[in-house]
């Protein structure tokens, strides 16, 4: 029983992040313009991984797709390729892990096959989750990156008589809902982990062997033997410890500009 | 068609208060930001102050900040100007206006209410 | 505040030919995000309110007759009417729509020769 809420709970877990990740990759807030500098300002700026987008006050917001791939950054190519391995692997683990769900029966498919296919899974799910962490992470670090470069930059162009203000950029509402996204799913690949040592077939039972002792019409037979896992008593009514690991959702609040403006 | 139509105005005592309307139609009046614009006898345009369209941001020139407030009732599809501690430099024909249009532009104004500060 | 600076205050043209008014900003207007400048012209005819002219500092509003150009970029910006009309004798403003309060320039009274 405890396998099963593992295993669905796993699933269930994997889903919400993968939803996560593949929101956090179309979102279009990847970066918003810092206001610390400028507060008042009636045109917002915000960039995703496929277009730059700018709100003005009016309510009119105008985007922009960046229709070219060779001159783009090789970051964000490689945050954009990360997101997508991230979700292809994602896609795959769900499909896989329905099929290896305990709770649906599809024909005599044995447990060990159930036990092979939540592995796969999982480590799909892990692979995953570490795909969106990474690609947030990098983005992340772009933009911190070049938020001091241009920081630099405004303190040293302040010569002239007119002043230039800079657009610098900071993290978008996106990377939370990446990093956050890509934690679940990585959390549920390690429950279908977890889950799947609770379907394998762990039991090998030798078959009874009579010893005839002499003068004695008494056959022995020991008990069956124990394939050397390291966990305890009969497979068919086996426990494991279902932890309950638990993520408290932050919901991480940043300027948000006007209404657009 | 856009109409705004502003209302409110009059003659009050350095040290009053007034409160200018604006009643707007023709358009989704709670999805634009909406300003109030004024004009000095024989002076330049001088914006006032500007409110998003759900009321989150709000904007006042330094020379009413403190004094003037702004509101909008979005259900009414009224713009509203409070203006309070009114001095003799307050003296003008207040417009409403929206950015209707793209580039935070001021493509709709309304024909003016006059407002006069003396004793 | 971005200050803007109008030039001429006043300006006299005679009928069909060009006439051209600076404005000038203390800040830059110019948005990177859209590469568009933040600035808007209005005309204002005698006793009546206030017209769009052009928005983002060279588009047009539709409508409005091709005599008038808006160019310039950053913190320089200019309007032109290329061939004068009567019905063009107006005050004209113009606007920053980057960073609040949305100053307005003083205005330049063009009047016919």
């Known amino acids: 029983m405890a396998v099963t809420a593992c295993q669905g709970l796993g699933f269930v877990v994997s889903l919400i992040g993968i939803a996560g990740i593949i929101a956090a990759t179309c979102m279009d807030q990847w970066s918003t313009q810092d206001l610390y500098n400028n507060p008042v300002t009636a045109v917002f700026n915000y960039q995703g991984l496929w277009r730059s987008c700018v709100r003005e006050s009016s309510g009119f917001t105008e985007c922009r797709g960046y229709f070219t791939l060779l001159g783009l950054p090789a970051m964000l190519q490689a945050v954009r390729a990360l997101m997508i391995v991230g979700i292809v692997l994602g896609a795959i683990g769900l499909l896989v892990s329905i099929f290896a769900l305990k709770c649906i029966r599809i024909g005599s498919m044995e447990d060990s096959a159930k036990a092979n296919m939540t592995l796969t899974s999982g480590i799909m799910f892990i692979v995953s989750g570490l795909c969106a962490i990474a690609g947030v992470s990098v983005f992340a670090n772009m933009l911190v990156t070049n938020f001091w470069m241009s920081t630099a930059n405004m303190y040293t162009g302040m010569g002239g008589m007119v002043q230039t203000v800079q657009t610098r950029y900071t993290f978008g509402a996106a990377l939370f809902v990446g990093w956050v996204a890509g934690g679940l799913t990585l959390i549920g690949g390690v429950m279908m982990c977890i889950a799947c040592r609770g379907l394998a077939p762990e039991e090998t039972n030798y078959k009874a062997v009579s010893y005839h002792a002499s003068g004695h019409s008494v056959a022995y037979k020991p008990g069956g033997f124990k394939a050397s896992t390291g966990f305890g008593s009969n497979t068919k009514n086996k426990k494991i410890y279902d932890g309950g690991a638990r993520t408290e959702d932050e919901v991480q609040s940043y300027p948000s500009k006007h209404d657009y403006v | 068609e856009v109409q705004l139509v502003e209302s409110g105005g009059g003659l009050v005592q350095p040290g009053g208060s007034l409160r200018l309307s604006c009643a707007a139609s023709?358009?989704?009046?709670?999805?634009?930001?909406m300003h109030w614009v004024r004009q000095a006898p024989g002076k330049g345009l001088e914006w006032v102050s500007y409110?998003?369209?759900?009321?989150?941001?709000?904007y006042y020139a330094d020379t009413v900040k403190g004094r003037f407030t702004i509101s909008r009732d979005n259900a009414k599809n009224s713009l509203y100007l409070q203006m309070n501690s009114l001095r003799a430099e307050d003296t003008a024909v207040y417009y409403c206006?929206?950015?209707?249009?793209?580039?935070?532009?001021?493509?709709?104004w309304g024909q003016g209410t006059t407002v006069t500060v003396s004793s | 505040d971005v200050v803007l600076t109008q030039s001429p205050d006043s300006l006299a043209v005679s009928l069909g030919e060009r006439a051209t008014i600076s404005c000038k900003s203390s800040?830059?207007?110019?948005?990177?995000?859209?590469?568009?400048?933040?600035l808007t012209w209005y005309q204002q005819k005698p006793g009546q309110t206030p017209t769009l002219l052009i928005y983002?500092?060279?588009t047009r509003k539709s409508g409005v007759p091709d005599r008038f150009t808006g160019s310039g970029s950053g913190t320089d910006f200019t309007l032109t009417i290329s061939s004068l009309q009567a019905e063009d004798v107006a005050v004209y403003y113009c606007q920053n729509v980057y960073s609040y309060p949305l100053t307005f320039g003083a205005g330049t009274k063009v009047e016919i020769k």
């Open positions: 206006a929206t950015s209707y249009y793209y580039g935070n532009a001021l493509e709709y």
């Open positions: 983002w500092a060279s």
């Open positions: 409110i998003s369209s759900g009321s989150g941001s709000i």
């Open positions: 023709g358009f989704t009046f709670s999805s634009f930001g």
């Open positions: 800040q830059s207007l110019f948005n990177v995000g859209n590469q568009k400048n933040y």
